[in-house]
Interface confidence: medium
């Protein structure tokens, strides 16, 4: 044992940090970190802030240990936010707005632009900002399946809350399907769970982006936080690089 060389953990740590720093810089196509002087003045763009806030709020509620990622997934993913098609779009006219459900449609061309191939998608989350909720609500999420049918995906019991909160549904499989087929617009439905003992089957929860009669300036902010799909995918060039390095091995 005396012949064993002691490991300088500090050095290992520094090298590891350098490696990660290098990966981040290459991902950003930068040779070195930008200096403070290069940081643009003024507030962050609304879209960046909204994405940060929704992620921060979700992470705050999570305490489970993350699963170890396979080597291919260790490297940076590209994260894209695709907003729901606005509610004044004609697609919504085909679906009778009811007190029981809300509908959320997405433009698949925007999804394909973000993720060109289904295999590149590692995770897709549907994120909704729920507003104050006075009573408990059991909700169910459905995927638009064919002309007049909906496929059940999952359910959630929402506890009463006096402040806004982000809800997140894992819809990876559904988005992969959408990327594989040729549809132009695909959608989800959020409905109140129907049960014999519930007070009524009205969707009590108020989801940001669906409330009408808002002042113009508030409507813009409201629209920024309307439901969206958060896509995490391996960039095409990174996937190709991984593929070729596997062949070399």
């Amino acid at each position: 044992l005396s012949t064993c060389k002691t490991i300088d953990m500090e050095l290992v740590k520094r090298k590891r940090i350098e490696a990660i720093r290098g990966q981040i810089l290459s991902k950003l196509r930068l040779a070195s970190p930008p200096s403070q002087g290069e940081v643009p003045p003024g507030p962050l763009p609304e879209a960046v802030l909204a994405l940060y806030n929704s992620t921060r709020d979700r992470v705050a509620g999570e305490s489970a240990e993350p699963e170890p990622e396979p080597e291919a997934d260790y490297y940076a993913k590209e994260v894209t936010r695709v907003l729901m098609v606005e509610t004044h779009n004609e697609i919504y006219d085909k679906f009778k707005q009811s007190t029981h459900s809300i509908y959320m449609f997405f433009n698949t061309s925007e999804l394909r632009e973000a993720v060109p191939e289904p295999v590149l998608l590692s995770r897709a989350e549907l994120r909704l900002l729920r507003l104050k909720l006075k009573v408990e609500q059991h909700v169910e999420l459905y995927q638009k399946y064919s002309n007049n049918s909906w496929r059940y995906l999952s359910n959630r019991l929402l506890a009463p809350s006096d402040s806004p909160e982000w809800l997140s549904f894992d819809v990876t499989g559904v988005v992969r399907q959408w990327l594989s087929r040729g549809g132009e617009i695909e959608g989800f439905r959020l409905s109140a769970h129907c049960s014999c003992d519930s007070r009524d089957n009205t969707l009590q929860v108020d989801i940001n982006g669906f409330t009408t009669g808002r002042r113009g300036d508030l409507a813009t902010i409201h629209g920024m936080n309307r439901p969206f799909l958060l896509l995490m995918a391996t960039p095409l060039e990174r996937a190709q690089h991984l593929q070729s390095s596997r062949h070399r091995r």
């Epitope: 009573v135 408990e136 506890a159 007070r199």
Partner: antibody
Framework: VEESGGRLVTPGTPLTLTCTVS????????MNWVRQAPGKGLEWIGY?????TTYHANWARGRFTISKTSTTVDLKMTSLTTEDTATYFC????????????????WGPGTLVTVSS | AFELTQTPSSVEAAVGGTVTIKCQAS??????LAWYQQRPGQPPKLLIY???TLASGVPSRFKGSGSGTDFTLTISDLECADAATYFC??????????FGGGTKVEIK
Amino acid sequence: VEESGGRLVTPGTPLTLTCTVSGFSLSSYAMNWVRQAPGKGLEWIGYIYTSGTTYHANWARGRFTISKTSTTVDLKMTSLTTEDTATYFCARGTGISDYYYWVMDLWGPGTLVTVSS
Amino acid sequence: AFELTQTPSSVEAAVGGTVTIKCQASQSISTYLAWYQQRPGQPPKLLIYKASTLASGVPSRFKGSGSGTDFTLTISDLECADAATYFCQSYCDGDSVGFGGGTKVEIK
């Protein structure tokens, strides 16, 4: 369930009360804070759900904040006035059914907060 | 604003007798009402929830009834240990969680 942190403070002083639980998990039960002024009735302040979601009484919103760790529930109070002098109770929601976050089956002995100049 | 009115504020009864306490809500709360007993110097104790369901370990001498806006707690075969203040509580939704003013029960 046991409350701590109650003491004599001057008006305007912030104060945090802590409720420590054992024998059950905060990931399974909602917790409530209720107060009782000397010789008066009970007043619900708010609750925190298993997920960390909170709901406060209208009068308490903005001045009282409930948060939690794995074994404790905190009540943070700001801008205290003499009207806030009371025994503060921490109480567990029954968990009998999902609707009953606010039906309280296990109470702490309470901690006394006195606000006086 | 939502209000819960409890009557009477105090009542006196003999051992073995019966006491009736009323609780009225300013709007319908279905059966989302609970009753608590608080003895001097102690925290409250849950007696009844869902207007009429007895909590675990509570004797059947305690009976809750009512729905909508009018509720009643009846204590029969009164014992000395029943001397306490009783509170009703509404929990229909987040904005209507609250307690009645309380009824002090004294045993002669």
